[in-house]
Each structure stands twice: as C-alpha cells, then as structure tokens.
Interface confidence: medium
Amino acid sequence: FYDIETLKVIDEEWQRTQCSPRETCVEVASELGKSTNTFFKPPCVNVFRCGGCCNEESLICMNTSTSYISKQLFEISVPLTSVPELVPVKVANHTGCKCLPTAPRHPYS
Amino acid sequence: FYDIETLKVIDEEWQRTQCSPRETCVEVASELGKSTNTFFKPPCVNVFRCGGCCNEESLICMNTSTSYISKQLFEISVPLTSVPELVPVKVANHTGCKCLPTAPRHPYS
C-alpha cells in the first residue's frame, strides 16, 4: 500500500514535469537562420522555452505567449576582418505554455 | 566598443549554456521501452541529462558517467485489472558530460 508522504513526493515531481516555460539553451545561428559566413560567440544563449509533459499523448506542450529578449553577442565574420563586434540579438522567450492538440481538429477550417 | 562589465555578463551566460548535466523531463514509457498495454503515472520524471552547447560544430554534448536513480511510480495495466501499484523504476541520471566528436576520427580503428 502507499502512504500519503509517498503520494506527496510523486505529486510534487509530477508538478515539476508539467508543461511550462523552462530555461533552455538555444543555438543563436539556427534560431536566426544566419548566413554561413557570420557566426556568433557565444554560439548559445539561455532563454525560456516551453517544455515538459502533457497528460495525453495527443497533446503537445506549446507556447501561448512569447516575448523577445535582447542578448549582447559577438558577431564574427569569416574570414575574420574587424575586431569582433558586440551586437544586440533578439531571441524568442516563451512566457506562457499550454498542452494543445498536435494538429487542429478541423484542418479544413 | 564594449566594456568589461558587459563581457562579464556574456561570460556568465556562456558558462551557464555549456555542456553539463541539466534537469530534464523524460517520459518513462519511452525510456523503458515498455509495452503499449502498460503505462506509468506520472508519465514523466525529472532526471539529469547532458545538454548545452559545445564550442565546435563537430562536437556534441555526451554523458561520460551515469547513475541510476529509483523513482516511485504507479504502474497501470490496460485494461485495468487491479489497483494501480507503486513500483520503483530505475532511470538513467547523467552525472558527467563532455563535448565529444560526433563520430570517431578513425572509424576503421
């Protein structure tokens, strides 16, 4: 049988696994779709992205609201010409998440 | 031009994006490769998995050491025959990570 303390531990873990904005490491170049002769240093930044579990397999954790935050990064051209330049780069930051159907119910609508 | 304080902020962010064990939500059923007539509640647990950025595109963040931690979960059979039972489930927990080549340099060795 199981006691209330064990159930509390399980419930707390479940709450922590649920769909919510989580700090995630994203690669800037692939995020911005930049040309191959420009790259960023650091190549990655921390932002919040929706992640975690949904109760049903037919649902996926998706963002419902997004803000854009500015990160200061070095933009470097290859071959290296000027001293690396600090540029502000806007990256999507998920502020709200929800478990939503993987496809719209009425794809024809 | 950029001042040292700006660089410190960038440096701190970069440290946080680097390849290391990170708390991640994993789906137990796919982790264990369980049959479709058995599922777990909660369906997901939090464990540490390697994630983050590597300095070079040819490297990926991989685990170098792993421990197995036990999580108490309800194992449910479909169709439901008995009261859901609390079972200990062992899940891989990455304790060390490193940026390693995506493929060995000498595949023939």
Epitope: N37, T38, K41, P42, F74, E75, S77, P79, L80, T81, S82, V83, P84, E85, L86, V87 | F1, Y2, I4, L7, K8, I10, D11, W14, N55
Partner: antibody, heavy 117, light 112 residues
Framework: QVTLKESGPALVKPTQTLTLTCTFS??????????VGWIRQPPGKALEWLAN???????YYNPVLRSRLTISKDTSKNQVVLTMTNMDPVDTATYYC?????????WGQGTLVTVSS | DIVMTQTPLSLPVTPGEPASISCRSS???????????LHWYLQKPGQSPQLLIY???NRFSGVPDRFSGSGSGTDFTLKISRVEAEDVGVYFC?????????FGGGTKVEIK
C-alpha cells in the same frame, strides 16, 4: 581599473629574438570576448598593428610579419608574451600592449626597443 | 593592406580657431555588417595614444564636444571647433574593418 604594462629588453642585437611581456590588471583574459594585442611605433612614424590573442587562444598576426611573430598567454598570471625573431634595426620602435576591443581603448605606456650592434 | 592617408602632415593652429584633419582610405571601410570602423586617436607628447572618436562620429567618454568626426566610405574628417592648448599632439586615424588593422601616418597639431 584597466592597466597594461610592457616589459622587456631596451636593447637587442640584430638577428636576435625579442621577447616582450605584457602584464595587465583590471580584466581577465579568460573572460568571454577579451583580447590583448601588440602595436608598435618606430620613432616619429605611424603605428603598426602586430598581433593579438583572444580568450579562446585564437591568434591573429599581421600577415607581413607573421613568420617572425609568436603571441601566447598565461591567463593565471595575467600576462601575454610576444616574441619576434630575427630582429633588424628597422624594428627599433616603441612597443605597446593594448586591450583588444573595437576600437583600442586601453593602451600600455609602451616600451622602447632599440635594435643595434 | 588598407593604406590610410592623412593630410596635412603638420597643422599649425591658433587657439580658439577651428582645425580640420582629413583621412582617406585605399578601400571602403564599410564592413559587411554595415558598420564603418574608422577611429581617431590623439597621441600627446611622451604619452600613449588615446581614443577620441570611434566608428566615424562617436565621441569616446570624456572627450570634449569640440571634437567631431564625419565621413563615409573612404573619406573621413576630424574637426576641432575651437583649438585649445591642450589639444597639441599627433592625431592618427585608424581602421579596424579589414585585417590587418592599419593606422594613418599622423597629423602633428601645434600652436602657432
């Protein structure tokens, strides 16, 4: 407060190797995006960029002098070392250490190196 | 290499009067990222160069507003609206758009 100080021999004989050390404070070369470089100025003449080294140990050299120059760093000591081989009297100059930002904001006081037999 | 040509070589000035220095590059200094990395330094007698203007027209912190920079492409100008005695020294233009980063030959500003 950022400071950089050059040290090395004041006099070098032709064909010898010059070794200069830049000791800096107020920043760390392990900090992301940081660089240290060397610029020289012959007496009464223009400035000439020589080399620089980045936090990741990437190195860039003036192509004209590349074969004679080596730059290295000791992050724990806050030092950058420049070596220049096969010195010639035309290499007589004041050698400056700079913190590499775009543009160069912080410069050392410079050290005069004379090449003479 | 990008050649930076400064004129005049020497500039005798009267305190309170304006002064202008020209800098011409052998190639455009517009970087592929759109910025123009043309900077001006002043080297006072017996001192290291100090930054005055960066990226054509931006005054560095602490630089008096009598100093201004302008220009584009290959032609650039440093202006001093009213020269003061403390402005004497050698003025250098510099480009960091292309490697190797290069400097002009310098313009010596002295009081008449």
């Amino acid at each position: 407060q950022v400071t950089l100080k050059e040290s090395g021999p004041a006099l070098v004989k032709p064909t010898q190797t010059l070794t200069l050390t830049c000791t800096f404070s107020g920043f760390s070369l392990s900090t992301y995006g940081m660089g240290v470089g060397w610029i020289r100025q012959p007496p009464g003449k223009a400035l000439e960029w020589l080399a620089n080294i980045w936090w990741e140990d990437d190195k860039y050299y003036n192509p004209v002098l590349r074969s004679r120059l080596t730059i290295s760093k000791d992050t724990s000591k806050n030092q950058v070392v420049l070596t220049m081989t096969n010195m010639d009297p035309v290499d007589t100059a004041t050698y400056y250490c700079v913190q590499v930002t775009n543009p160069f904001v912080f410069w050392g006081q410079g050290t005069l190196v004379t090449v003479s037999s | 290499d990008i050649v930076m040509t400064q004129t005049p070589l020497s500039l005798p000035v009267t305190p309170g009067e304006p002064a202008s220095i020209s800098c011409r590059s052998s190639q455009s200094l517009v970087h592929i990222n759109g910025n123009t990395y043309l900077h001006w330094y002043l080297q006072k007698p017996g001192q290291s160069p100090q930054l005055l203007i960066y990226k054509v027209s931006n005054r560095f912190s602490g630089v008096p507003d009598r100093f201004s920079g302008s220009g584009s492409g290959t032609d650039f100008t440093l202006k001093i609206s009213r020269v003061e005695a403390e402005d004497v020294g050698v003025y250098f233009c510099s480009q960091s758009t292309h490697v190797p980063w290069t400097f002009g030959g310098g313009t010596k500003v002295e009081i008449k």
